[in-house]
Amino acid sequence: DTEIKVNPPQDFEIVDPGYLGYLYLQWQPPLSLDHFKECTVEYELKYRNIGSETWKTIITKNLHYKDGFDLNKGIEAKIHTLLPWQCTNGSEVQSSWAETTYWISPQGIPETKVQDMDCVYYNWQYLLCSWKPGIGVLLDTNYNLFYWYEGLDHALQCVDYIKADGQNIGCRFPYLEASDYKDFYICVNGSSENKPIRSSYFTFQLQNIVKPLPPVYLTFTRESSCEIKLKWSIPLGPIPARCFDYEIEIREDDTTLVTATVENETYTLKTTNETRQLCFVVRSKVNIYCSDDGIWSEWSDKQCWEGEDLSKKTLLR
């Protein structure tokens, strides 16, 4: 019996199409596949950012694969050919590994890259990113932001920079059509007469950095002699009611009475007839049904009742 062998794929490479971290891994079939014409060859691909403990593993019949990477670090990948057992009248046969790496040659020292990058998607409508200049860079240093997400033909540069002392320290993004629930890639690079500036790469999903507007139209309604219903409305904008969680803070006669997490736009409070003043505020956050993370809104304006019998009136701010 001659041992069945198969070659690894040819021309294995990582291609950067300029999408700021979304890379193509591609290869060609192995040499000498003639013996296995009736066979569907598969490929096992493993890849990771250098420094990561775990490999991502894909088994595919295709000659390419696409995924997102952190371009602040290098990328390593390896691939081998798999002949299923049906092709070999026995056990699966694997080729040796073909390996490749990719990294962007870093310019400048790490301290020159932007510091404290912070992006917030306000009310699921307006994306704003801000940063601080690198440590020790001169005032002639300027930073430029580029972004890409699936659906754009190519990476775009920010057209509305936020400036301080003539330097770009942030970006107001235009309307970003169909940009949520997918990776959003950003590169901030820089230029200086004095010294090279290190680029920084960031990846996130917009729905996970939403800061909603606070709830509005806070009201009180007396339900019974010992119960008051607090109500509010979802803030204006594109976020549906089912996506909100709320936190409510109620103060009775200058003492914090209740802090509670609430899933809908009402809260029933048990009170005593001695209550002289009742105030409450509410804030909102996108819940786990609509995102993996989120940012609490600012607190709403305070709504108070004070001074007269609560049972006699419904209060509307």
């Epitope: 009611a241 089912r242 509670a260 997490t261 899933e263 809908n264 786990i288 049904y289 993996d292």
Partner: antibody, heavy 115, light 107 residues
Framework: QVQLQQSGPELVKPGTSVKMSCKAS????????IHWVKQRPGQGLEWIGW????????KYNEKFKGKTTLTADKSSSTVYMLLSSLTSEDSAIYFC????????WGQGTTLTVSS | DIVLTQSPATLSVTPGDSVSLSCRAS??????LHWYQQKSHESPRLLIK???QSISGIPSRFSGSGSGTDFTLSINSVETEDFGMYFC?????????FGAGTKLELK
Amino acid sequence: QVQLQQSGPELVKPGTSVKMSCKASGYTFTSNYIHWVKQRPGQGLEWIGWIYPGDGSIKYNEKFKGKTTLTADKSSSTVYMLLSSLTSEDSAIYFCAVLRRLDYWGQGTTLTVSS
Amino acid sequence: DIVLTQSPATLSVTPGDSVSLSCRASQSISNNLHWYQQKSHESPRLLIKYASQSISGIPSRFSGSGSGTDFTLSINSVETEDFGMYFCQQSNSWPLTFGAGTKLELK
């Protein structure tokens, strides 16, 4: 009042599929998530997934992907769960539940997989 | 996945005793922890939501506390109708997970 009425017990053979139902009443069907939870005899509870009848969006526990298919019929306010390629490990009580904004559970559907 | 560890597995008590049931999360879940009671051949019933918030119609002897990773369900003066299984459940992230349960039984 809110009710989740589940279909009756099922006795099926290994390798087959079963579709159980959960009929909702007493609240706005299209505005609440309906979850499914599995409980094997004498054991704990496992979350399977949810469906939002308003737009048909679905989220599954990775563990149950491929095993479970959730669907909703707005006209009858009913959610369905299809379990496929059944084995004895799928023998359990399956609950539908509204776990957000309200908290209501169906009475459970007992599935027995046996040859 | 977030793992919820309940202790003790079984608690044998006499009516009138006060008891505490523990639930520990494998990572911080803020206050996104809920307690359920389940009696034999019944569906679970929500007792406490968001770690400490009481539920309308649930007796006031049930209370909850904790935040982050450590949570407690307290029953002040157990009544005979309280015997059964108690489960904690987290809603901090997907998949939703439940503890294995604490069985409250008659001594």
